[in-house]
């Protein structure tokens, strides 16, 4: 139905504006939910209809027509969000997409020349949709009051139908790879966020804690509680929708996944207004930031590692709980920037902006996760440093991409475990841990290129260095090394599942008194440092001012032993 109409046009992607921008006819019939005007700049043509729009994100126009027994009526015309198959066409050649009501058929086209969407080249006769036929009469938008009334009636019908479809499809959500084609978006993904999202007057913005490509993360307050606010510019509404869709999945509540509070709109100033995700704030910051400043004893390191594995195991797991279906999810961007430290010292996985819902075995019949279009949609995601070899060399198993993406996450997890353990003094009985380094930073520095990573991790099969002293501190002296090697194995199929990582870490959690330390272990192993040796002052909360004027309180990070490296910024989401 309309859900599969290809309302891809309603989801912009944040890519650079093409050099010679395409100009398309712009029209939206009364009553159409959502708008594509954010996909371009409307040109001032006075009161004349149709209007023109200069595309921001593609060089492609689209048109949607409703063909009934006696005429074809234009429903929408405008810019596509990205250049996709069909956009190379010089003319608008519509193809049937849905039957919104008996006796009518929706046709859509994409084309790649200026104003090509003003008219279609031909439509099949209404009785036989999909077969070439004589051209139907083109109804010029705004031709007459009569036309407007007919349109209005039709769209009231359409709206009723749409409403019931949306209700029926509430469980049927589709999620997309950031910046990739949207084969079948969520029914509501085309909603105009500025209308649909409520402002939260009591939400206040304090300080920027991370600036990313698609969003700025603020620390703030909502009803007296500390929150993280992920603010998206309007051009990144697709990224907002994708991440929101994942956070809103039923059953996604877990101690070790950042908690989603609400979606809203607004900003620290009138000019900076856009869609917002309001999330739980973790004042201790990102794993990367934390490890830069603090070392952690064996118990604390294991707590971090175990909670991280638990969070990932939960994400990966497909499950039914309390009658709700939670699909398996691949994170696809696990990095120490995107993992946060909770008050109790455990981890919470954040930034689901690139996460992908995976095909399942037990999903309900109405459930259809996205089938990403082509290998690029699956492969091109994440922070390069943490990308699995099969993503770096584009050999990921596309036959079973769900399992393949889980295994790629496990590789990233292994690098995070290594980063955590590298800052554990108990694993270095002969010396204190060196300053924090990201995985592969020792070998490749702060900003490795994809070529350098490929040469190191794929061609040479090298992995971060594991000191021999790590053998000292575990139930099984080789357990840590074996665990990491089984997670970052060059062979993806040989990697452990997140659940098994959890089990193996749990088995390492308590060094057995009866287990003698190996003779090769220098000076035995030291006692654990006290539990509170890495405690951090709680954030100081100053009075909060309403949304428009940024409020001020400080999210303290504790005394800083050295400045975070450029590669590592403070990031609570």
């Amino acid at each position: 139905m309309l859900g599969s109409l290809g309302l891809w046009a309603l989801l912009p992607t944040a890519v650079e504006a093409p050099p010679n921008r395409r100009t398309c006819v712009f029209f939206e019939a009364p009553g159409v939910r959502g708008s594509t005007k954010t996909l371009g700049e409307l040109l001032d043509t006075g009161t004349e209809l149709p209007r023109a729009i200069r595309c921001l994100y593609s060089r492609c126009c689209f048109g949607i027509w409703n063909l009934t027994q006696d005429r074809a009526q234009v429903e929408m015309q405008g810019c596509r969000d990205s250049d996709e198959p069909g956009c190379e066409s010089l003319h608008c050649d519509p193809s049937p997409r849905a039957h919104p009501s008996p006796g009518s058929t929706l046709f859509t086209c994409s084309c790649g020349t200026d104003f090509c969407n003003a008219n279609y080249s031909h439509l099949p006769p209404p009785g036989s949709p999909g077969t070439p036929g004589s051209q139907g009469p083109q109804a010029a938008p705004g031709e007459s009051i009569w036309m407007a009334l007919v349109l209005l009636g039709l769209f009231l019908l359409l709206l009723l139908l749409l409403g019931s479809i949306i209700l029926a499809l509430l469980q049927r959500k589709n999620y997309r790879v950031r910046g990739e084609p949207v084969p079948e978006p969520r029914p509501d993904s085309g909603r105009d966020w500025s209308v649909e999202l409520q402002e939260l007057p009591e939400l206040c913005f304090s300080q920027v804690i991370r600036e990313g490509g698609h969003a700025v993360v603020w620390a703030g307050q909502l009803q007296g509680k500390l929150v993280a606010i992920k603010a998206f510019p309007p051009r990144s509404v697709a990224q907002f929708q994708a991440e929101r869709a994942l956070y809103e999945l039923p059953g996604l509540q877990h101690d070790h996944i950042v908690r989603f509070i609400t979606a809203s709109r607004g900003g620290p100033g009138r000019l900076l207004s856009g869609p917002l995700l309001v999330l739980e704030l973790h004042p201790k910051g990102s794993l990367c930031h934390y490890l830069t400043q603090y070392t952690s004893d064996w118990g604390s390191s294991l707590r971090m590692a175990l909670s991280l594995a638990q969070g990932l195991a939960f994400l990966h797991e497909e499950r039914w709980q309390n009658g709700q279906y939670k699909p398996g999810i691949a994170h696809r961007d696990l990095s120490s920037q995107n993992v946060l430290i909770r008050e109790d010292g455990s981890c919470a996985i954040g930034d689901l902006g690139l996460a992908l819902v995976l095909p399942g075995l037990t999903q309900p019949p109405a459930w259809t996760p996205t089938q990403p279009q082509g290998p690029a949609a699956i492969m091109e995601a994440g922070t390069q440093r943490y990308m699995a070899p099969e993503l770096l060399d584009k050999t990921l198993d596309l036959q079973d991409w769900g399992m393949a993406l889980r295994r790629a996450d496990i590789y990233s997890l292994a690098l995070l475990l290594w980063e955590i353990l590298s800052r554990c003094p108990d694993l270095r009985p002969d010396s204190s841990p060196p300053p924090f380094q990201l995985a592969y930073e020792a070998e490749l520095g702060n900003t490795p290129t994809s070529d350098e990573l490929w040469a190191l991790a794929v061609q040479e099969r090298r992995r971060p260095y594991i000191p021999s002293t790590w053998r000292c501190f575990a139930t099984d002296p080789d357990g840590l090394r074996e665990l990491l090697e089984d997670c970052w194995d060059a062979d993806p199929e040989a990697r452990l599942t997140a659940e098994c990582v959890q089990q193996r870490l749990a088995a390492l959690a308590h060094p057995q008194e009866s287990h003698p330390f190996p003779e090769s272990c220098p000076r035995g192993c030291p006692p654990l440092c006290p539990e509170d040796c890495t405690s951090i002052p709680a954030p100081t909360i100053l009075p909060c001012r309403p949304q428009r004027s940024a409020c001020h309180f400080s999210v303290q990070q504790g005394p800083c032993s050295r400045n975070p490296q450029p590669a590592c910024t403070l990031s609570p989401v």
Epitope: M403, R462, D476, D478, D486, T497, E499, C500, A507
Partner: antibody
Framework: QVRLVQSGAEVKKPGASVKVSCKAS????????IHWVRQAPGQRLEWMGW????????KYSQKFQGRVTITRDTSASTAYMELSSLRSEDTAVYYC????????WGQGTLVTVSS | DIQMTQSPSTLSASVGDRVTITCRAS?????IAWYQQKPGKAPKLLTY???SLKSGVPSRFSGSGSGTEFTLTISSLQPDDFATYYC?????????FGGGTKVEIK
Amino acid sequence: QVRLVQSGAEVKKPGASVKVSCKASGYTFTSYHIHWVRQAPGQRLEWMGWIYPGDDSTKYSQKFQGRVTITRDTSASTAYMELSSLRSEDTAVYYCTRGDRFAYWGQGTLVTVSS
Amino acid sequence: DIQMTQSPSTLSASVGDRVTITCRASSSVRYIAWYQQKPGKAPKLLTYPTSSLKSGVPSRFSGSGSGTEFTLTISSLQPDDFATYYCLQWSSYPWTFGGGTKVEIK
């Protein structure tokens, strides 16, 4: 205490199949790979393949591909190795071993192929 | 396949001797493991990776090497050490063992 206990010796005719079992105890069965290694009389050890009980994935040596099938029953914490189209050269002791670089081994199962 | 060639295939030595066994790989490998096997028994892991002794293995055993050449050294041979020793590479499939070195009493 980690233990891998294998099924008893088998005598088979050429062309037949043999299925050897390996019951694991003393650890979480799904947490480690189980590998199968064989040793013909007076010969070197030969790696045959592995199964990862955590997700049931398998990997076989090209030499045995098509003839060997490794399976598992997680409820019984048991892995199985089935070798088909047996020939006299398959006479060997078959070992299961845990995937932490073979730190733990079963006691071995002698399979004799003879007409 | 990566071939692992052990030398010597047989080595006669006396208690107290220093013994060195070599394992050469036909192409570069990251790590190897060494195993000891006694007649009628399953192999026993000695070192992994390359130079780290498995817990409970006496310190007279040591492993070293990189790339294509690896050695296992027994600093002072004990009566319990007379056995056959195998190296294993797991850098690429199929995982391959060396042909074995039998250490016997002189």
